[in-house]
Interface confidence: low
């Protein structure tokens, strides 16, 4: 006869490990006893349990409540045992010794491998700002046994680099994702993907990118200068920009205070019925925590009663300042 077993038994941390040992013999042969031992290079052979054909399972005190027989029905030639709730300390070599009648004794060894699934964590990098060079967007760390694989899933262009730290019973892998921040990345997902043989499916942690930026400012409302005539109602100037964080808007007049009745409402400057007093240079100031930008326009209010007055071209200029 011979023993049927496995060279390597692999389980996930906390699972029950089935240590297989089946005697394949002639029809008239019987298994009297199976002795299980842990073979440790430092501590030598330690008894785990005795499985007797008549008296059943007798577990060594060191493994009490941890070793069981597989659930019935059980073949009398099956000497397999279950090691409950495998932990990393259970990793190592195990031996089954089978005493048969009349063929004698057989023995086999197997290695128990305990997979420790990683518990990944994602740490965002420093705040991202448009205009920075290559910058850390996020790092992802996962520790397990064996070493997990840590990669990134994203549409964003960037570079990833990994490093490993090996501990006595596990390995920690950290992967960093670097990118050159641009506003198009704002709101884009950056997903850390952790693969490991102890996981049924990859573990994924998603970080949403936030890139601080501030667009150039421009002013809308002066497209048709002829509309800016004395007496017109509802005239407005609207400041256009975008940014992250969302910018704040402010309006001033370059050549003095805002005329009476001119109202600032966020990005919009609202005028009362126009008079020539509303002519002047208006400045829209846009700012967020990253920087600030200005756009100025010249408003010329035309008086239809003064036909000799020529229409001036509207001029605009833009400035920006970084904080």
């Amino acid at each position: 006869g011979e023993l049927e077993t496995s060279d390597v038994v692999t389980v996930v941390l906390g699972q029950d490990a089935k240590l297989p040992c089946f005697y394949r013999g002639d029809p008239d042969e019987q298994v009297g006893q199976v002795a299980w031992a842990r073979v440790d290079p430092n501590e030598g052979i330690r008894e785990l349990a005795l499985l007797h054909s008549k008296y059943g399972l007798h577990v060594n005190p060191a493994y009490e409540d941890r070793v069981e027989q597989p659930p019935p029905p059980r073949d009398p030639l099956d000497g397999s045992v279950l090691l409950r709730n495998a932990v990393q300390a259970d990793e190592g070599e195990y031996e089954c010794r089978v005493s048969t009648f009349p063929a004698g004794s057989f023995q086999a060894r197997m290695r128990l491998r305990v997979l420790v699934p990683p518990l990944p964590s994602l740490n965002p990098g420093p705040p991202l700002e448009e205009g920075q060079g290559l910058t850390l967007a996020a790092s992802c760390t996962a520790e397990g046994s064996p070493a997990p694989s840590v990669t990134w899933d994203t549409e964003v262009k960037g570079t990833q680099s990994s490093r490993s730290f090996t501990h006595p019973r596990s390995a920690a892998v950290t992967s960093e994702f670097h990118l050159v921040p641009s506003r198009s990345m704002n709101g884009q997902p950056l997903t850390c993907v952790v693969s490991h043989p102890g996981l049924l499916q990859d573990r994924r942690i998603t970080h949403t990118l936030q890139v601080a930026f501030l667009a150039e400012a421009s002013v809308r409302g002066l497209e048709d200068q002829n509309l800016w005539q004395v007496g017109r109602e509802g005239a407005t100037l609207k400041c256009l920009s975008e940014g992250q964080p969302p910018p704040k808007y402010n309006w001033t007049r370059l050549d003095g205070p805002l005329p009476s009745g001119v109202r600032v409402k966020g990005d919009t400057l609202g005028f009362p019925p126009l008079t020539t007093e509303h002519s002047g240079v208006y400045v829209c100031h846009v700012s967020n925590e990253l920087s600030s930008r200005d756009s100025q326009v010249t408003v010329e209010v035309l008086d239809p009663e003064d036909p000799g007055k020529q229409v001036d071209l509207v001029s605009a200029s833009h400035h920006h300042h970084h904080h």
Partner: antibody, heavy 120, light 107 residues
Framework: EVQLLESGGGVVQPGRSLRLSCAAS????????MHWVRQAPGKGLEWVAV????????YYADSVKGRFTISRDNSKNTLYLQMNSLRAEDTAVYYC?????????????WGQGTLVTVSS | DIVMTQSPSSLSASVGDRVTITCRAS??????LAWYQQKPGKVPKLLIY???TLQSGVPSRFSGSGSGTDFTLTISSLQPEDVATYYC?????????FGQGTKVEIK
């Protein structure tokens, strides 16, 4: 559904003993570390003790070391805290808490707590 | 032993406000930090572990960050149901101590 139910609290005189129990259900009790955490009236949380999934390893806060003993009976799905030489400062609600894994040592489920009052 | 210190000890904010609570360890603990929420008269609830990993079922307005000694719990938009005391806890080695707690109230 994971359930943890503490019992054994009450009023006790200083220097006396008390034994708390925590009955667990809804998960494989023998696969998880278990902890005791306490909270004095109107105060914050204080970790007291942990026992490994199999009872082989135990750790205690300095404030209870030598006086309290944590134990478990996996066949009964029950966690215990034997409290000896009780002091007034041991007055608190005692929670049993399930470890997130076999020894991560943070807690994903808590019992409702049992009040221990040490007073003469 | 490592001491965990939270700040502020209490705060009052309006619904919709961004709320930030910090937790500092007296020695580095890598990212072995958990955050718990305890509503008045209730048992603590796990919010975040590994410093920044959101526990299943916790609303996404909660987030955590930090590593080493300095950690932050952020509520991006405070809701009335977020009134509670929040605790940090380190779990790299025994004793598994908590911060003293931060009480969050609505203005």
């Amino acid at each position: 559904e994971v359930q943890l139910l503490e019992s054994g609290g009450g009023v006790v005189q200083p220097g006396r003993s008390l034994r708390l129990s925590c009955a667990a259900s809804g998960f494989t009790f023998s696969s998880y570390g278990m902890h005791w955490v306490r909270q004095a009236p109107g105060k914050g949380l204080e970790w007291v003790a942990v026992i490994s999934y199999d009872g082989s390893n135990k750790y205690y806060a300095d404030s209870v070391k030598g006086r309290f003993t944590i134990s478990r009976d996996n066949s009964k799905n029950t966690l215990y805290l034997q409290m000896n030489s009780l002091r007034a400062e041991d007055t608190a609600v005692y929670y049993c808490a399930k470890d997130y894994g076999y020894n991560w040592n943070f807690f994903d489920y808590w019992g409702q707590g049992t009040l221990v009052t040490v007073s003469s | 032993d490592i001491v965990m210190t939270q700040s502020p000890s209490s705060l009052s904010a309006s619904v919709g406000d961004r709320v930030t609570i910090t937790c500092r360890a007296s020695q580095g603990i890598s990212n072995y930090l958990a955050w718990y929420q305890q509503k008045p008269g209730k048992v603590p609830k796990l919010l975040i572990y590994a410093a920044s990993t959101l526990q299943s079922g916790v609303p996404s307005r909660f987030s955590g960050s930090g590593s080493g000694t300095d950690f932050t719990l952020t509520i991006s938009s405070l809701q009335p149901e977020d009134v509670a005391t929040y605790y940090c806890q380190k779990y790299n080695s025994a004793p598994y101590t908590f911060g003293q707690g931060t009480k969050v109230e609505i203005k």
